[in-house]
Interface confidence: medium
């Protein structure tokens, strides 16, 4: 009675920087001792190894089993469904998990005015979990940039979308004032990865810091 | 320091074209912004058409349609197209640019529609003379 289990419908990789999440889908009319075991293939070391016996959320942080993605050639991940003695087929992720799925995102976006110009600085990722050596600028050394929506308030339309390849940039206003939020994604030219958009951030600009100059 | 030079100035009928050009020296012109502004006598001096970093352009509505800026960052110069000249842009022109954030960056307009303040310019070349007699 080795397969009587139905095996998990899908499995997949949902992953930022040094934050390697495995999920899956549950199996139909699972029971309260459905548990899920979770096995992981890195290329090129062609044997699975087992992670977690009987994990009963619908998710895995593989983290900390996955901190060399980004010099290897990826890594593939199964998930079976075990009740008690009995236990479902493997599930394998269709798709090899490599640097190419992570999705880029930034650690934050700081604003402040400089001269009656906003200047932003974009802060990059700083993972607790990621090896000293492997900051964000140095796996994406080259190409890197940002795309930037700008909205004023009052309003909710986006005022305006840049691109900029660096992590600062000034914004000249001339001589606009009210608050303006920003949200910036990042992306790498030479690279496919996903990007997601940061959580906004806003700052007030009034006459007092306009000052003319011929 | 910036170092802004124009050239291309002069006289021309109306209906006429010119095309005027900005040496700029200093570091990492890709990265600025840059301006031409105008200043007819007795007159404010006003924001003509200006380019940042990424390439987007603002105009002053009374040249929308008939001048164009744009630049070369491998020359490191900014020009700015004239046609179809009218007496009305008789004005020393002037180039005038900003540099990116002091650690490095990139210098941005805020909206695509945002008015060139001559507030938000560092730096200013001494101008070349245009005259459009009719």
């Known amino acids: 009675h080795g397969t009587e289990l139905p095996s998990p419908p899908s499995v997949w990789f949902e992953a930022e920087f040094f934050h390697h999440i495995l999920h899956w889908t549950p199996i139909p009319n699972q029971s309260e001792s459905t548990c899920y075991e979770v096995a992981l293939l890195r290329y090129g070391i062609e044997s699975w190894n087992s992670i977690s016996n009987c994990s009963q959320t619908l998710s895995y942080d593989l983290t900390a089993v996955t901190l060399d993605l980004y010099h290897s050639n990826g890594y593939r991940a199964r998930v079976r469904a075990v009740d008690g003695s009995r236990h479902s087929n493997w599930t394998v992720t269709n798709t090899r998990f490599s640097v190419d799925e992570v999705t880029l995102t930034v650690g934050s976006v700081n604003l402040e005015i400089h001269n009656g110009f906003i200047l932003g600085k974009i802060q990059l990722p700083r993972p607790k979990m990621a090896p000293a050596n492997d900051t964000y600028e140095s796996i994406f050394s080259h190409f890197r940039e940002y795309e930037i929506a700008i909205r004023k308030v009052p309003g909710n339309f986006t005022f305006t979308h840049k691109k900029v390849k660096h992590e600062n940039f000034s914004l000249l206003t001339s001589g606009e004032v009210g608050e303006f939020c920003v949200q910036v994604k990042p992306s790498v030219a030479s690279r496919s990865n996903k990007g997601m958009w940061s959580k906004e951030e806003c700052i007030s600009l009034t006459r007092q810091y306009f000052t003319v100059t011929n | 320091q910036v170092q802004l030079q124009e050239s291309g100035g002069g006289s021309v009928q109306a209906g006429g074209s010119l095309r005027l050009s900005c040496a700029v020296s200093g570091y990492a012109y890709s990265t600025y912004c840059m301006g031409w502004f105008r200043q007819a006598p007795g007159k404010e001096r006003e924001g003509v058409a200006a380019i940042d970093s990424g390439g987007s352009t603002s105009y002053a509505d009374s040249v929308k349609g008939r001048f164009t800026i744009s630049k070369d960052n491998a020359k490191n110069t900014l020009y700015l197209r004239m046609n179809s000249l009218k007496p009305e842009d008789t004005a020393m022109y002037y180039c005038?640019?900003?540099?990116?954030?002091?650690?490095?960056?990139?210098?941005?307009?805020?909206?695509?529609?945002?008015?060139?303040?001559?507030?938000?310019?560092?730096?200013w070349g001494q101008g070349t003379q245009v005259t459009v007699s009719s």
């Open positions: 005038a640019a900003v540099p990116p954030p002091p650690d490095g960056g990139s210098c941005l307009f805020l909206g695509p529609e945002i008015k060139v303040s001559k507030a938000d310019f560092r730096y």
